[in-house]
Interface confidence: low
């Protein structure tokens, strides 16, 4: 999947299986990524687990789990708030669009999470105070925590290079260099560009991600995934000057 | 061990003379001792990762608070934390920091925080 980190680095990761996105004293988020096509290196998120840790007088530990074709509007125990404590309503799940869009607000830690199902796969976005991000017991054992450190270099796909290589060509040309098997022949580069431009008029990294996804999979739902990801940034990012990210040299993952 | 949970426990035991079932007229003192105990555990949280006594204490304080109808707010023998503990190496960073009014949004408890964003989508 495409990852925008807490430090506004933008990466395309081929990480497969379960990986931690966030892990601190209050919140743990883990994603499971699966290949989008058999044999493909490109992966998308098929499962998401969010654990809101027990927080003294405010909330009981609550676990939220979403999977492909299952975007519940409740925690795994069936509740929609933080439990029986007097501050339980400082953690709330709201269903925005049934089966497609859920928002979780954890007021006690100033955090908003948006989970969507777009096509077969899930998207995730969070707004969280730096103070909460930094509330970890032991920095040295934090390991690979994607939102903070990004993907390991050997798990990144340089999709910007594919974007450059494929301008004016069809999917057949991309397939030779692509991390995925040949996408449907009926999806030329020009069509991908047109479909992405329709939803993402600014040629930023979200637009480029959209083009990459369409050429890699032939699945038009990925257009919407990029569109909603940008919409979520508009809602959640505190720096309005950083909504759009533009092409630049690929970052090394953070320490 | 740098984890000072046993010190917190013994201070609590001294303060309550080893009694966990005080007479009703002792309850204010017992609750004050519990709040001091809670504060002590928060202060040592950072160095108590994986320590059984620490995690047992955190849960037990909550149990005892409710058993004896102690309010979270009230006198202690030490100053109290009302905010999320600061980041960095502060001794007061904690597993389960206390916020007095969960319902109020986060920035009521500290200066307006710097927010940050992370997102994951597509392939």
């Amino acid at each position: 999947p495409h990852l925008r980190t807490f430090t506004d680095r933008f990466q395309t990761c081929k990480v497969q299986g379960a990986w931690p996105l966030i892990d601190n004293n209050y919140l743990n988020v883990q994603v499971t990524n699966t290949p989008v096509l058999p044999g493909s290196a490109a992966t998308a998120t098929s499962k998401l687990t969010i654990i809101f840790k027990n927080f003294q007088e405010c909330v009981d530990q609550k676990v939220y789990q979403a999977e492909m074709d299952e975007l519940p509007a409740a925690f795994v125990d069936g509740s929609k708030n933080g439990g029986d404590k007097h501050g339980a309503n400082s953690l709330k799940i709201t269903e925005k669009v049934s089966g497609q869009h859920v928002e979780i607000r954890a007021k006690y830690i100033g955090t908003t999470i948006v989970v969507r199902q777009v096509g077969r796969y899930l998207t995730f976005a969070v707004r969280v105070p730096e103070e909460v991000v930094n509330a970890v017991e032991d920095w040295d054992s934090q390991g690979l925590y994607l939102c903070l450190r990004g993907c390991p270099l050997n798990q990144q796909i340089d999709f910007q290079a594919f974007h450059t290589n494929t301008e004016g060509t069809g999917a057949r040309r991309l397939a030779a260099a692509s991390p995925a098997p040949t996408a449907p022949e009926t999806f030329p580069y020009e069509t991908a560009v047109a479909k992405c431009k329709e939803k993402l008029p600014v040629e930023d990294l979200y637009y480029q991600a959209c083009v990459f996804d369409l050429l890699t999979t032939g699945d038009v739902n990925f257009t919407l995934a990029a569109y909603y990801a940008l919409e979520d940034v508009k809602m959640l990012h505190s720096n309005k000057d950083k909504l759009h990210l533009y092409e630049r040299t690929r970052d090394l993952p953070g320490r | 061990s740098p984890c000072k949970i046993l010190k917190c426990n013994s201070e609590f035991w001294s303060a309550t003379s080893g009694s966990h079932a005080p007479a009703s007229d002792d309850t204010p003192e017992f609750c004050a001792a519990l709040r001091s105990y809670a504060l002590c555990t928060r202060r040592t949280a950072r160095t108590c990762r994986g320590d059984l006594a620490y995690h047992s204490a955190v849960h037990g304080i909550e149990d005892l608070m409710s058993q004896h109808n102690c309010s979270k707010d009230g006198p202690t023998s030490q100053p109290r934390l009302h905010t999320l503990p600061p980041a960095g190496d502060s001794q007061e960073r904690s597993d389960s920091p206390e916020i007095c009014h969960c319902e109020k949004s986060f920035h009521k408890h500290s200066a307006t925080p710097n927010y940050t964003h992370c997102g994951l989508f597509g392939d």
């Epitope: 027990n54 | 013994s10 035991w13 994986g50 059984l52 995690h55 849960h59 149990d63």
Partner: antibody, heavy 120, light 109 residues
């Protein structure tokens, strides 16, 4: 009723791994730690380690470090203990036990035990 | 060898009192409030009898009592009964280690 129900007996070859489960019911799983204790035939009790379902923190007996892994699944209120590189001296009954919550420390509820036999 | 030392066995007639000792160091027993005692009948799981040196969980008869002096914790069974015949283990929590005694076989004569 507070209960811990463990998985059935296992027979393993030396060098293999075993994973024992312990399903909790009748209480809030995340409010108490789970300890694992083993007892070799005719011997005393031997503490293996502890896990907090609340935080995921673990605390293993020094002599088992590197061979034992304790995990929990809060969605099913189940604790797991995996022991690798088994040797004949690991033959024992393995118990899970709930750790009493609080400034109190004790093991107040025990599973029925799982016999693990390591034999070639 | 266990970190806490218990006598291998003690015995007494019905109605008598028996005391089982559990000796450790100042850090494992002397300074610890976390000493607990467990009863185990053959083929059964252990059962908590006392915790935090002196406290009795509900359901445990009051003939079981605990004390501590220096680096030695003790379990006393007063008014011994036939069903008290079992193995008894002490446990102390010290730092991040849980220490077991080797166990004491109580025989009712």
């Amino acid at each position: 009723e507070v209960q811990l129900v463990q998985s059935g007996a296992e027979v393993k070859k030396p060098g293999a791994s075993v994973k024992v489960s312990c399903k909790a019911s009748g209480y809030t799983f995340t409010s108490h730690g789970i300890s694992w204790v083993r007892q070799a035939p005719g011997q005393g009790l031997d503490w293996m380690g502890w896990i907090s379902p609340y935080s995921g923190n673990t605390n293993y007996a020094q002599k088992l470090q590197g061979r034992v892994t304790m995990t929990t699944d809060t969605s099913t209120s189940t604790a797991y203990m995996e022991l690798s590189s088994l040797r004949s001296e690991d033959t024992a009954v393995y118990y899970c036990a709930r750790v009493g919550s609080g400034p109190y420390y004790y093991m107040d509820v025990w599973g029925q035990g799982t016999l693990v036999t390591v034999s070639s | 060898q266990s970190a806490l030392t218990q006598p291998r066995s003690v015995s007494g007639s019905p109605g008598q009192s028996v005391t089982i000792s559990c000796t450790g160091t100042s850090s494992s027993v002397g300074d610890s409030i976390y000493v607990s005692w467990y009863q185990q009948h053959p083929g059964k799981a252990p059962k908590l009898m006392l915790y935090d040196v002196t406290k009795r969980p509900s359901g445990v008869p009051d003939r079981f009592s605990g004390s501590k002096s220096g680096n030695t914790a003790s379990l006393t069974i007063s008014g011994l009964q036939a069903e008290d015949e079992a193995d008894y283990y002490c446990i102390s929590y010290a730092g991040t280690d849980t220490l077991f005694g080797g166990g004491t076989k109580v025989t009712v004569l």
